[in-house]
Interface confidence: medium
């Protein structure tokens, strides 16, 4: 059977296919898809290999009417380089000499200056020229070749391999040589394919089940790196959550060189975007980045600089990070227009269960615009899909010179954009060069502007028009899910229930409030529970949340408020130091890290208690 890279070379005029009878005889025969001798494949941008012999089509010289035969593949040889010319001509590179059927006297395929029907070739069974099934470089992982591409065919222990192999290995890992002669050069890498054990090339975040692959030893351009990820059904890394950045900072902390991520501004008319189409809502630029120099359109994560991001020229050669698995985005279903009967008040326009209204004439600063929308029963608009954006542009009477407030902002947590209506950020469409968020230009709010209605961050104090959005009247009541084993309003994780205490309280007051709830200020047993709590409180606007840890009882010895051993810590830098006090978790960029505060400071808090009753699904019967 043909694999997708293989093809038969077919001449329509003769209705016959090229047949490699032997290395010195390349002729034609009646087409037979099962014949190994008729199968060919591209093994580089310009070389065609016979699958049967693992040798490449070539000529002895670039002259008219010489026989085309098979040679040991040599990527440097000018006599093995082929290119598709107009229509279905295949020619030797750089010359007007073509792959030709031969004639009655000459059974071999020949190199010939004529470009008639006998020099025209298609992939058998299609109308396509031979280049339509062109070569796709396979970028290696690990190994010792800096992520170079597989060189097919390659020689290992005097045998030629045209595919990845586990030969010479007891673990079954698939590998390839990255030069034609592995025996001499000893350069290799593992193939970006699925094989027994290939999962260990990935690190899985236990909180989100997203997997990451750090290719720090590779040296690829941004586009090559992206291709390598895609070959593994993955994409270059996107980071949309503070938790994700924290996890990757930890994962890359022992490295020093930059690693490509998916952030880029390669689209001509729009701004910064993730290659996997995740929303660009979290910013973690290195000071001074992104620099506006032309050509610096791709972004690297800098492990040596606290994993911050820097824009570089895409042709630089760096390591890279791939990401696969569940997206880190919250699952958020946007109803389609037909799903929802939408009834709107006068002057509001309906779309997919919501009503929209542009306020163009009464210009307001963002805060006042938000207040007005909320008084009208809505909020500044959130936008969750390209279709919703298109509706606003095309149906609402949006004009090309408009500059209108939408609900996106990073007022609560700097460099982390959120919708003011609390819906998750699932989509962004920034203008070219945006968001241009610079610390010295406090641009915490977002506008739609220009003919396409793309977005830019803007100082919140500008008086502008704005767009309001509200739920249409026909939508049913919201359902608050009660998690099994936990009371309403509590969140379950493993054996425990957790609740955020919303009253600003001293440590003692917080402890008392938890006790009144038959609970206690949270303990943190390990990094998994810490990761859960980071995701639980890390993105909230308040700066601190009390935990149950303090050294009130014995100065210098930190203990939980309940009889629980301290087996794990997650101190912020310079903590705990020598000052006595009570421990609170930070939010924002330092999300989850522990600081020692004065116990009479006021903060919110997290209560915890054992979940009730059966906490696991029934034991499977064997």
């Amino acid at each position: 059977l043909l694999d997708t890279r293989q093809f038969l070379i077919y001449n329509e005029d003769h209705k016959r296919c090229v047949d490699a009878v032997s290395p010195s005889a390349v002729q034609t025969a009646a087409c037979n898809q099962d014949a190994e001798s008729q199968k060919f494949r591209w093994v580089s941008e310009s070389q065609i290999m016979s699958v049967a012999f693992k040798l490449c089509l070539g000529v002895p010289s670039k002259t008219d009417w010489v026989a085309i035969t098979l040679y040991a593949c040599d990527s440097k040889s000018e006599f093995q380089k082929w290119e598709c010319k107009n229509d279905t001509l295949l020619g030797i590179k750089g010359e007007d000499l073509f792959f030709n059927y031969g004639n009655r006297q000459e059974k071999n395929i020949m190199l010939y200056k004529g470009s008639g029907l006998w020099s025209r070739w298609k992939i058998y069974g299609t109308t396509d020229n031979l280049c339509s099934r062109g070569y796709e470089a396979m970028y290696t992982l690990l190994g010792n070749a800096n992520g170079a591409t597989c060189a097919f065919p390659f020689k290992f222990e005097n045998k030629w391999y045209a595919d990845c192999t586990s030969a010479g290995r007891s673990d079954g890992w698939l590998w390839c040589g990255t030069t034609t002669d592995y025996d001499t050069d000893k350069l290799f890498g593992y193939c970006p394919l699925k094989f027994e054990g290939s999962e260990s090339l990935w690190n899985k975040d236990p909180l989100t089940s997203v997997s990451y692959q750090i290719n720090s030893k590779s040296a690829l351009t941004w586009h090559q790196a992206r291709k390598s990820c895609q070959q593994q059904n993955a994409e270059l890394l996107s980071i949309t959550e503070i938790h994700e950045q924290t996890y990757l900072t930890g994962l890359t902390s022992s490295l020093t060189s930059g690693l490509w991520i998916g952030l880029n501004s390669l689209s001509f008319n729009s701004g910064w975007q993730w290659s996997d189409r995740s929303p660009f809502r979290y910013l973690n630029w290195l000071p001074g980045s992104p620099s506006a120099e032309p050509g610096k359109s791709c972004v690297s994560l800098n492990p040596g600089k606290n994993a911050k991001w820097e824009n570089l020229e895409c042709v630089q050669k760096l390591g890279y990070i791939c990401k696969k698995g569940n997206t880190t985005l919250n699952s958020f279903v946007i109803p389609s227009e037909s799903d929802v009967p939408t009834h709107c008040p006068s002057q509001w326009w309906p779309y997919a269960g919501h009503c929209y209204k542009i306020h163009r004439d009464e210009k307001k600063i963002q805060r006042d615009a938000l207040t007005t929308c909320r008084k009208e029963g809505g909020d500044l608009t959130s936008i969750h899909t390209i279709e919703e954006l298109d509706f606003i542009i095309s149906q609402l009477g949006y004009e090309p010179n408009d500059e209108l407030w939408i609900g996106l902002n990073d007022i609560k947590i700097q460099m982390y954009f959120e919708w003011s209506d609390g819906t998750p950020v699932t989509f962004t469409k920034w203008l070219r060069g945006e968001p241009s968020h610079e610390n010295n230009r406090q641009e915490d709010c977002v506008v739609m502007k220009g003919k396409d209605g793309y977005w830019a961050d803007r100082g919140c104090e500008w008086p502008l028009g704005y767009i309001c959005k509200m739920k249409s009247r026909s939508q049913g009541p919201e359902i608050v899910e009660v998690e099994k084993g936990c009371r309403k309003g509590w969140k379950k994780h493993h054996f425990y229930c957790y609740m955020i205490g919303h009253t600003l309280s001293t440590f003692a007051e917080a402890n008392q409030t938890c006790n009144n709830e038959n609970a206690y200020l949270t303990t943190i047993e390990d990094r998994y529970e810490q990761a859960f709590l980071t995701s639980f409180v890390g993105l909230r606007p308040e700066k601190y949340f009390w935990t149950g840890l303090s050294d009130i009882q014995t100065k210098g010895t930190f203990q939980w408020t309940i009889e629980e051993e301290v087996r794990f810590t997650h101190w912020n830098s310079d903590m705990p130091g020598r000052k006595p006090g009570c421990v609170a978790m930070r939010t924002g960029i330092a999300g989850g890290l522990w600081d020692v505060l004065k116990c009479d400071e006021k903060a919110k808090f997290v209560c915890k208690h054992w979940a009730e009753g059966v906490t696991h699904p029934p034991k499977p019967t064997t």
């Epitope: 690190n203 899985k204 975040d205 236990p206 909180l207 089940s209 493993h494 054996f495 303990t523 047993e525 390990d526 998994y528 529970e529 939980w560 309940i562 009889e563 629980e564 051993e565 301290v566 087996r567 696991h616």
Partner: nanobody, 121 residues
Framework: QVQLQESGGGLVQPGGSLKLSCAAS????????MGWYRQAPGKQRELVAA???????NYADSVKGRFTISRDNAKNAVYLQMNSLKPEDTAVYYC???????????????WGQGTQVTVSS
Amino acid sequence: QVQLQESGGGLVQPGGSLKLSCAASGSIFSIKTMGWYRQAPGKQRELVAAVSSGGSTNYADSVKGRFTISRDNAKNAVYLQMNSLKPEDTAVYYCNADGVVAWDQPYDNYWGQGTQVTVSS
């Protein structure tokens, strides 16, 4: 993979005592909470007691004051000391653990095969 092996079950008279033991073996990186569940014939399985890696404990109301759960983190073992046993304590007792086999894996829930406890005169 993590295996849990229970021992110590048996037949005991009302008012008597038994001590159940459970040891985890296999490829263990870390064990968080360990606990005991029980299932009487025709009834739903219920939590008896659980203990966190730091030593905090949780008991079903029906066993409070009679049963004591303890744990040896070094041995990845959990114990259930059952005193003042009653006929209604008769059930298959299952050991349970939230364990993780590698640093980059999420927690999995593991179960023992169960040990029979019968309280009867």
